[in-house]
């Protein structure tokens, strides 16, 4: 990896699993305010693999609420707006960090945590499955 | 909000900006160790609304590699393999979280940070847009 | 014209599985998805599931995810329903319909959970 | 999933008159970008299968008589029966095809008064 010279004004830690553990700062930095996806773009809904959005709330992780994607249909709309059964909705998933708290229920002290999310669909070209 | 009752076994934080600042464990915790999108699916190939995944990255962040989504095309891809420029190929973007080294090559400090990632691309119906 | 012909009535005990089948006839099988739908003595009807013909790809009802399977074989025009760890609830008449909305459906298949 | 609600349970009707049964759903079954309501209706008779009436909550299937006529957008849709003829007492089902599971309304029955 890159070597990065460290800066003497650094907080010092004392913390025996150091560098496992680290101070992070709540305060976001490029927060947008925006956090309803359903008002940031109607992609969802004019899409060829619409899709819904469903709110998944866990206050023992930050961020609290993530929205979770979920394909309306097996196929996608096709120009007449029937499902095309000859091609798929699929779902775009990415991996994201999320703070766990860690202990349970303390306000100050959390575990990185990755999970994959759903974050909207796509129309594929199936793969087709042949008969044994 | 939800009110957690909190556990008596949690760290002690003497921080004057408590709860701003909290002690966060970089061992992930739902590791998943396939990282790059383009070995966890091939729909980026196979969408009606195809994308280039670049490597972004920044080892002043955390994670320091991160893959962005480009569309290939302004349209989306027909049942012939053509360009139809009546549809509209556009990114689906994820607002996701980031720690930030603050202070800059800090190796044990951290600030969040949330930035807006593009993870696929997916094929819309246009809004069309009438000469008055 | 377009036939769908299912496969006769079945009984069966508590925990048994049942594979009913839906030819298909009259036009080009894998052109339209095939769905399932059920409906028990003097109910409504219940949508199970659908299969793309084509690819084989399916979209299941979370109600009955892990119990059924639906499957296709396009050299003899045929889909396939099956129904594992079957209940007494279970009991009703399956249905295969053509097409996005139902536009033909099979004379339908009576399955009675009975011990 | 989407909560289909069919009204009234029974409609008792003599030939001749005019039917009108309502659905409504949880939530929207317009598509806002093709201006479509994903919504079916089903007519069903004793030992028979269900048979397609109208689709896109207003499109009649090829073959059905147009004295079957759809309405409405969104959440509210009914089905209406300009003059019924005989043949037409049976359960009549509506469904949302806007997002799976594809789920009907528990049916309407119109019977000879």
């Known amino acids: 990896g890159i070597t990065i010279p460290r800066n003497p004004g650094c907080p010092n830690s004392e913390d025996k699993n150091f560098p496992r553990t680290v101070m992070v700062n709540l305060n976001i930095h490029n927060r947008n305010t925006n956090t309803n996806p359903k008002r940031s773009s109607d992609y969802y809904n004019r899409s060829t693999s619409p899709w819904n959005l469903h709110r998944n709330e866990d206050p023992e992780r930050y961020p609290s609420v993530i929205w979770e994607a979920k394909c309306r249909h097996l196929g996608c709309i096709n120009a007449d707006g029937n499902v095309d059964y000859h091609m798929n909705s699929v779902p775009i998933q990415q991996e994201i960090l999320v703070l766990r708290r860690e202990p349970p229920h303390c306000p100050n002290s959390f575990r990185l945590e990755k999970i994959l999310v759903s974050v909207g669909c796509t129309c594929v070209t199936p793969i087709v499955h042949h008969v044994a | 909000g939800i009110t957690i009752p909190r556990n008596p076994g949690c760290p002690n934080s003497e921080d004057k900006n408590f709860p701003r600042t909290v002690m966060v464990n970089l061992n992930i915790h739902n590791r998943n160790t396939n990282t790059n999108p383009k070995r966890s699916s091939d729909y980026y190939n196979r969408s009606t609304s195809p994308w280039n995944l670049h490597r972004n990255e920044d080892p002043e962040r955390y994670p320091s590699v991160i893959w962005e989504a480009k569309c290939r095309h302004l349209g989306c891809i027909n049942a012939d393999g053509n360009v139809d420029y009546h549809m509209n190929s556009v990114p689906i973007q994820q607002e996701i979280l980031v720690l930030r080294r603050e202070p800059p090559h800090c190796p044990n400090s951290f600030r969040l940070e949330k930035i807006l990632v593009s993870v696929g691309c997916t094929c819309v119906t246009p809004i069309v847009h009438h000469v008055a | 014209q377009v036939q769908l012909v299912q496969s006769g009535a079945e009984v069966k005990k508590p925990g048994a599985s049942v594979k009913v089948s839906c030819k298909a006839s009259g036009y080009t099988f894998t052109d339209y998805a095939m769905h399932w739908v059920r409906q028990a003595p003097g109910q409504g009807l219940e949508w199970m599931g659908v299969?793309?013909?084509?690819?084989?790809?399916?979209n299941y009802n979370q109600k009955f995810k892990g119990r059924v399977t639906m499957t296709r074989d396009t050299s003899i025009s045929t889909a396939y329903m099956e129904l594992s760890r079957l209940r007494s609830d279970d009991t009703a008449v399956y249905y295969c319909?053509?097409?996005?909305?139902?536009?033909?459906w099979g004379q339908g298949t009576l399955v009675t959970v009975s011990s | 999933e989407i909560v289909m609600t069919q009204s009234p349970g029974t409609l008792s009707l003599s030939p001749g008159e005019r039917a009108t049964l309502s659905c409504k759903s949880s939530?929207?079954?317009?598509?806002?970008?093709?201006?479509?309501?994903?919504l079916a209706w089903y007519q069903q008779k004793p030992g028979q299968a269900p048979r397609l009436l109208i689709y896109f909550a207003s499109t009649r299937e090829s073959g059905i008589p147009d004295r079957f006529s759809g309405s409405g957008s969104g959440t509210d849709f009914t089905l209406t029966i300009s003059r019924l003829e005989p043949e037409d007492f049976a359960v009549y089902y509506c469904q949302q095809h806007y997002s799976t599971p594809y789920t009907f309304g528990q049916g309407t029955k119109v019977e000879i008064k």
């Open positions: 319909a053509r097409g996005n909305y139902g536009s033909d």
């Open positions: 939530q929207s079954l317009l598509n806002s970008s093709n201006q479509k309501n994903y």
């Open positions: 299969i793309s013909t084509y690819s084989g790809n399916t």
